[in-house]
């Protein structure tokens, strides 16, 4: 069995990716420069560490989390890295053009790299729903469209609703989930006879997926606190996220056992549910006043995640063609919504407590923001899905879904592995 790309893709991918990279280099040459201010070097290192945490989350965490397929683990990890590298470059430029360009050149700071990494993370969440069914050329398109859509969404929310960096980036969970699900909906769904085994998980890839989940679990407090303006807010965010993810781990493992007739623990449930608390607490992590509230949220999120993992895959597989182990999309869509609802509840409680009519108005604004995020995610996701269906990309044939050998050179293998 040949492990080569089809000839047309072999021409298309390098040309498409390298032309794009050359264009990005030119844009960086003409439109960007580094922040010239002389900063305290210790402060610089501390600031960089936050960005480093985010990169670890993206490259190792999400990279390995999506690697549980028996025959698609190499592609999952490497394609994630490829998308991250491309996404960060485009996100830096896009954020700069949207926010600072009128003043001249785009100034690149550690903060802009931090923002860009988080924007690129959105693609890595979304792509879980389509990995294995698309090639790298299609993923490049997905990166460009999604980063652009998210950048514009954040800009619109910032300008219309006057939301700060943290609040408008926390729509990433809902945005990424709905974007990924709508792209998946557009792609060819039925798996032909004889390929069902490829979307099953295997022990070693499942272990690496668990490793990814562990990295995400460790660094989720950094993600939720990265864009907050003051140390007090960051401290609260770190503590609350930590308590929430700690409880969601306990809930995930025990809930998974509870959901199984023989009391066995499902790897797939655990991979995803351990992160549940971090997603659910994200929007309001800096506002939650005491640990027990964050812990209750972690508990609820863990239960929702396990429940979703038990009952939703059948529906998602039929309607969207998403394999059972790719549960990040609907998991994040439910938990992201939970997180947004919790924030709205906090606003409502504030209204009741203070009798302040303006906060009632803020509730409406928050609902508007959430609705806008979902609408833009669905629309841009559908657009991406339609683009990915174009013949020009030479998408892998359905029989080649979830197969590393289509993309990678394995000298020691003639067939299967």
């Amino acid at each position: 069995m040949s492990s080569k790309y089809p000839r047309s893709v072999r021409r298309c991918l390098p040309l498409w990716a390298l032309t794009l990279e050359a264009a990005l280099i030119l844009l960086f040459y003409f439109f960007t420069h580094y922040d010239a201010s002389l900063e305290d070097q210790k402060g610089l290192v501390a600031s960089y560490q936050v960005g480093q945490d985010l990169t670890v989350m993206a490259a190792i965490g999400l990279g390995f989390l999506t690697s549980s397929f028996r025959r698609h683990s190499w592609s999952s990890v490497a394609f994630n890295l490829f998308m991250l590298a491309l996404g960060v470059q485009w996100a830096i430029l896009l954020d700069g053009f949207l926010s600072q360009f009128p003043s001249g050149k785009v100034v690149i700071t550690l903060f802009s790299i931090r923002l860009a990494t988080m924007s690129a993370l959105s693609v890595l969440i979304s792509v879980d729903a389509v990995l294995g069914k698309v090639n790298l050329a299609q993923l490049v398109v997905m990166v460009l469209v999604e980063v652009t859509a998210l950048g514009n969404l954040r800009m619109v929310i910032s300008n219309i609703f006057n939301t700060d960096y943290h609040m408008n980036m926390m729509h990433i969970y809902v945005f990424a989930a709905y974007f990924g699900l709508s792209v998946a909906w557009c792609l060819p769904k039925p798996l032909p006879e004889g390929t069902e085994d490829k979307d099953q998980t295997a022990t070693i890839p499942s272990l690496s997926a668990m490793l990814g989940a562990l990295f995400l679990w460790m660094f989720w407090p950094s993600f939720n606190s990265a864009l907050l303006r003051s140390p007090i807010e960051r401290k609260n965010a770190v503590f609350n996220t930590y308590y929430a993810v700690a409880v969601s781990v306990v809930t995930a493992i025990s809930g998974s056992s509870l959901a199984h007739p023989q009391g066995k623990i499902s790897k797939t449930y655990v991979h995803s549910a351990v992160l549940a608390g971090g997603v659910a607490v994200g929007t309001s992590c800096h506002l939650i006043p005491s640990p027990w509230l964050a812990m209750v949220l972690g508990l609820v999120a863990g239960l929702i995640s396990v429940g979703g993992a038990k009952y939703l895959p059948g529906c998602c597989n039929r309607v969207l063609g998403i394999p059972h182990s790719s549960i990040m999309g609907y998991n994040f869509s439910l938990l992201g919504l939970l997180g947004e609802i919790i924030y709205i509840v906090l606003l409502v409680l504030d209204t009741v407590g203070a009798g302040n009519g303006m906060i009632g108005f803020q509730v409406l604004l928050s609902i508007g923001e959430l609705s806008l995020a979902i609408v833009i995610a669905l629309m841009s996701g559908l657009l991406t899905g339609l683009l990915l269906n174009l013949k020009i990309w030479k998408a892998p044939h359905e029989a080649k879904y979830f197969d590393d050998q289509v993309f990678w050179k394995f000298p020691h293998l003639a067939v299967g592995f």
Epitope: S37, R229, P231
Partner: antibody, heavy 126, light 106 residues
Framework: EVQLLESGGGVVQPGRSLRLACAAS????????MHWVRQAPGRGLEWVAF????????YYVDSVKGRFTISRDNSKNTLYLEMNSLRVDDTAVYYC???????????????????WGPGTTVTVSS | AELTQSPSSLSASVGDRVTVTCRAS??????LNWYQQKPGKAPKLLIY???SLQSGVPSRFSGSGSGTDFTLTISSLQPEDFATYYC?????????FGQGTKVEIK
């Protein structure tokens, strides 16, 4: 005692540069965002620039963008304002101010400049 | 958001109740602060978040309002209160100040 003290002001010709410094004492400087605010003679207050507590994010008023740079050295408890291409209308008393974050209720942080330095005078004249 | 204070100056006597208003060009929720500045001195924070009194500030100072209309009230004017008062919004960049209201002795 919580204190901010500006220095570096003086008389300078248009087009030249000046660097203001603000020394902080009596509080954990690295835990606070910092602002520069100016006041032209006989006029009101005008916000100039702001930096986050860790220096990772900065904001400027449109009239100084590309000419002024705010920075901080948390190891020296010092805030800086590098002013290039100075113009006559940059003449003012420059204050540095500390930003306090306050949670009121349970759904919003509010920000205000709670500690100010005495100011340093910058005169741009030919 | 642009801030417009009124009046630009007022004369009052010790013991008077004084009200200064500040209007924003767009809704700024409760992101409004009030400062007092005496001649040759740095400004001093009085009220933050439209109505919360900064610690150490006498209770005769109070703030109210949300959205676009805000008020600073001095319930009983004292000799040390004769100064210029500024409102400032922290809702969106650029942070802006009102043009100031000078409270003078009648």
């Amino acid at each position: 005692e919580v204190q901010l003290l500006e220095s570096g002001g003086g008389v300078v010709q248009p087009g030249r540069s000046l660097r203001l410094a603000c020394a902080a004492s009596g509080f954990s400087f690295r835990s606070y965002g910092m602002h520069w605010v100016r006041q032209a003679p006989g006029r009101g207050l005008e916000w100039v620039a702001f930096t986050w507590f860790d220096g990772s994010n900065k904001y400027y008023v449109d009239s100084v963008k590309g000419r002024f740079t705010i920075s901080r050295d948390n190891s020296k408890n010092t805030l800086y304002l590098e002013m290039n291409s100075l113009r006559v209308d940059d003449t003012a008393v420059y204050y540095c101010a500390r930003e306090a974050s306050m949670l009121r209720g349970i759904s919003r942080y509010y920000y205000a400049m709670d500690v100010w330095g005495p100011g340093t005078t910058v005169t741009v004249s030919s | 958001a642009e801030l417009t204070q009124s009046p630009s100056s007022l004369s009052a006597s010790v013991g008077d109740r004084v009200t200064v208003t500040c209007r924003a060009s767009q809704s700024i929720s409760s992101y409004l602060n009030w400062y007092q500045q005496k001649p040759g001195k740095a400004p001093k924070l009085l009220i933050y978040a439209a109505s919360s009194l900064q610690s150490g500030v006498p209770s005769r100072f109070s703030g109210s309002g949300s959205g676009t209309d805000f008020t600073l009230t001095i319930s009983s004017l004292q000799p040390e209160d004769f100064a210029t008062y500024y409102c400032q919004q922290s809702y969106s960049t650029p942070w802006t100040f009102g043009q100031g209201t000078k409270v003078e002795i009648k």
